[in-house]
């Protein structure tokens, strides 16, 4: 779906900080100072999809656009 | 326990070519940004470039950018720095680190020495 | 590129001094603040991210502080094995580390 995210906090997954970058994806609470800004480095690390900031992990993470997923929203979603 | 691993700095004269290697281990390497920094001799801490986890996103310092690339093998747990026209100034001693933006972990480091 | 500029460049000090040390972005950087300690012949060892938070094993003498462009490291009751070299690094923009801060035995 489009508010599907590729973040270190999902299903239960328990990732390390900072930089670890996990693969369940899920939709995501949210809960106020949980994401933040993603640092203006990561402008381009979201392909099809907005950036926003793992607090607890210290890493970017994509909330992508509707009809693509993958960590970067770099790919099709072909059950779109 | 986490541990990185460099190898394959040395002496290299100005203009040559080194590739510096480090090896990971004690945590999902895959699933991690790694970065590399330097320090030259005596000086403070310069951060040189980074890759994500799948080796899609790549970032570089101006002062490298052009002569240096990173990439990984996450089937190896290596992370590898292919440095050319090696200058005077990139002497100094290479780290790998665990992080993108921020370095929880360091290897002890490889020296490089670019001299004539 | 973001300028990060360290202050004091050395200090002096005793066990069990409080010791300040500032860093100054030379634009803002909202949190994105780390703080590494080195030790001779050591590599860098992070001790406070997103400004103010502690490294898990921290010893909680050392604290963080600030947002935007300044920012501070503090250690409350300075310990025999807290002499090293203390690097700011912001990671809004690309990486950048401030030149260091030596503290020293008086």
């Known amino acids: 779906s489009g508010n599907s995210t590729r973040s270190p906090e999902t299903n239960g997954l328990s990732c390390g900080y900072p930089g670890e970058n996990c693969t369940a994806t899920t939709v995501q609470p949210k809960r106020k100072g949980h994401f933040s800004r993603c640092p203006k480095q990561y402008k381009h690390y979201c392909i099809k999809g907005r950036c926003r900031f793992v607090v607890a992990e210290q890493t970017p993470s994509c909330i992508c656009d509707e009809g693509y997923t993958g960590a970067r929203c770099e790919r099709v979603d072909l059950f779109y | 326990q986490v541990q990185l691993l460099e190898s394959g700095g040395g002496l290299v004269q100005p203009g040559g070519s080194l590739r510096l290697s480090c090896a990971a281990s004690g945590f999902t390497f895959s699933r991690y940004w790694i970065s590399w920094v330097r320090q030259a001799p005596g000086k403070g801490l310069e951060w040189v470039s980074y890759?994500?986890?799948?080796?899609?996103?790549?970032n570089y310092a101006d002062s490298v950018k052009g002569r240096f690339t990173i990439s990984r093998d996450n089937s190896k747990n290596t992370l590898y720095l292919q440095m050319n026209s090696l200058r005077a100034e990139d002497t100094a001693v290479y780290y790998c680190?665990?992080?993108?933006?921020?370095?929880?972990?360091w290897g002890q480091g490889t020296l490089v020495t670019v001299s004539s | 590129d973001i300028q990060m500029t360290q202050s004091p460049s050395s200090l002096s000090a005793s066990v069990g001094d409080r010791v300040t040390i500032t860093c100054r972005a030379s634009q803002g950087i909202i949190s994105y603040l780390g703080w590494y300690q080195q030790k001779p012949g050591k590599a860098p060892k992070l001790l406070i991210y997103a400004a103010s938070s502690l490294q898990s094993g921290v010893p909680s003498r050392f604290s963080g502080s600030g947002s935007g462009t300044d920012f501070t490291l503090t250690i409350s009751s300075l310990q025999p094995e807290d002499f090293a070299t203390y690097y700011c690094q912001q990671y809004d923009a690309l990486n950048t580390f401030g030149q260091g801060t030596k503290v020293e035995i008086k």
């Open positions: 890759i994500d986890s799948t080796g899609t996103f790549i």
């Open positions: 680190a665990r992080g993108g933006s921020l370095f929880d972990y």
